[in-house]
């Protein structure tokens, strides 16, 4: 038997990904633990392998169906089973009825590029990978960019309150490297978080002008 | 194998309220919803709600918020729906069906008239 | 509320033709259309789920296809039983709705 908190976590990816962190402060040595789902009206379930991901936290991908496909909407509810072998018998060890819809995660933005880029400013564009028809234009997004010296948890949050794939980055220094990070978070859902941050696009400012003797 | 089996036809005075059963077998009646759509005479099917009958979660067509109301008794494995304030226009056949992939099973349907 | 469009409203074939029905969704319904064959005074049967996807015991001449907001339903060789009122259905979003119906008559 296992002792301890349990914490049982998922989010949805809005089209066919369902992500799922178990943890468990109770020993689990050599055990084999699953996440099954069982949606609510569609004729089909899934299960996926927890694999450990530190010392009392198992995670895995629930994969529905092709990545672009919509697998589930907001009229759908999941139960969602942490399951356990025991010997020959399995054991639940967490349950949750699961609304997609109210706890969504996207993927994080894809395809980044400078546009434009001058002395001063830089104007970068990306993309939204994986993300439902639903939303519509129901999207806000945060930036952040690296300046020289600086960590990105120092790196002050600008926040684009509308579906926005580009970004006019201002009062730059010139001839210096940045990096630049977007993630994007739909405004449905009760639970919904931010996806992880984008992958980071470094780019450089173009060198001041010379000036001219007189 | 799977059924649904509706109450027998209702003739009601307009003001009136009826109330339809669905009685189900063959499947685990708590695990699916149960819902109820309408046909008017040569008409199309129009969607009135939804019952799970294991939570007693309940989605209704907003049109009918107000006057339609649905329960269940888990003992019978039967869903109701009742429908108040009836009008001429309300004259309909009724149906149960379960919600498995789309609305694969169909009770009989339930003929429901109203008139003065 | 999201619109099924069905077309044609009604239709005369003959035994062995191939009949296409279509459907147009308001707004896109991703692959969460159904389609169901009623016969006067009968309740609706299932056909179609997820857009493509047969019930069991329903006869391959049945398919149907679509994604987003354009939809169809083909029989490829019609059969004397075929002959019925045919209704798309959208459970993507409430209220759940249902196209208007095509009726299949014989020519």
């Known amino acids: 038997a296992v002792n301890g908190t349990s914490r049982f976590t998922c989010f949805y990816n809005s089209r066919a990904n369902i992500s799922c962190v178990w943890s468990q402060d109770g020993a689990l040595q050599d055990t084999s633990c699953q996440v099954h789902a069982w949606p609510d009206r569609r004729r089909w379930n899934q299960t996926c392998e927890l694999l450990p991901v530190s010392q009392a936290s198992w995670a895995c991908n629930l994969i529905l169906g092709t990545p672009d496909s919509q697998k589930l909407t907001a009229v759908d509810i999941v139960t969602l089973r942490v399951m356990c072998r025991e010997g020959v018998r399995w054991r639940m060890m967490a349950i949750q009825d699961f609304k997609p819809f109210e706890n969504l995660r996207l993927m994080a933005p894809i395809s980044l590029q400078v546009v434009h880029v001058e002395t001063h400013r830089c104007n970068i564009s990306w993309k939204i990978s994986q993300a439902s028809h639903y939303f519509e234009r129901h999207l806000e997004f945060e930036a952040r960019t690296l300046s020289p010296g600086h960590t990105w948890e120092e790196a002050p949050l600008m926040t684009l309150k509308q579906k926005q794939e580009w970004i006019c980055l201002e009062t730059l220094t010139p001839d210096t490297q940045y990096e630049f990070q977007v993630r994007v978070k739909p405004l449905q859902g009760e639970f919904t978080t931010w996806s992880p941050w984008s992958q980071p696009l470094a780019f450089r400012t173009k060198p001041a002008a010379l000036g001219k003797d007189t | 194998q799977v059924q649904l089996v509706q109450s027998g036809a209702e003739v009601k005075k307009p003001g009136a309220s009826v109330k339809v059963s669905c009685k189900a077998s063959g499947y685990t009646f708590s695990r699916y919803w149960i819902q109820w759509v309408r046909q008017a005479p040569g008409q199309g099917l129009e969607w009135m709600g939804e019952i799970l009958p294991g939570s007693g979660s309940i989605n209704h067509n907003e049109k009918f918020q107000g006057r339609v109301t649905m329960t269940r008794d888990t003992s019978t494995s039967t869903v109701y729906m009742e429908l108040s304030s009836l009008r001429s226009e309300d004259t309909a056949v009724y149906y149960c069906t379960r919600h498995y992939g789309s609305f694969d099973y169909w009770g009989q349907g339930t003929t429901v008239t109203v008139s003065s | 509320d999201i619109q099924m469009t069905q077309s044609p409203s009604s239709l005369s074939a003959s035994v062995g033709d191939r009949v296409t029905i279509t459907c147009k969704a308001s707004?896109?319904?991703?692959?969460?259309v159904a389609w169901y064959q009623q016969k006067p005074g009968k309740a609706p049967k299932s056909l179609i789920y997820s857009a493509s996807y047969r019930y069991s015991g329903v006869p391959s001449r049945f398919s149907g296809s679509g994604s987003g907001t354009d939809f169809t339903l083909t029989i490829s060789s019609l059969q004397p039983e075929d002959f019925a009122t045919y209704f798309c259905h959208q459970y993507s979003s409430y209220p759940f709705t249902f196209g208007q119906g095509t009726k299949l008559e014989i020519k």
């Open positions: 707004q896109n319904v991703g692959t969460d």
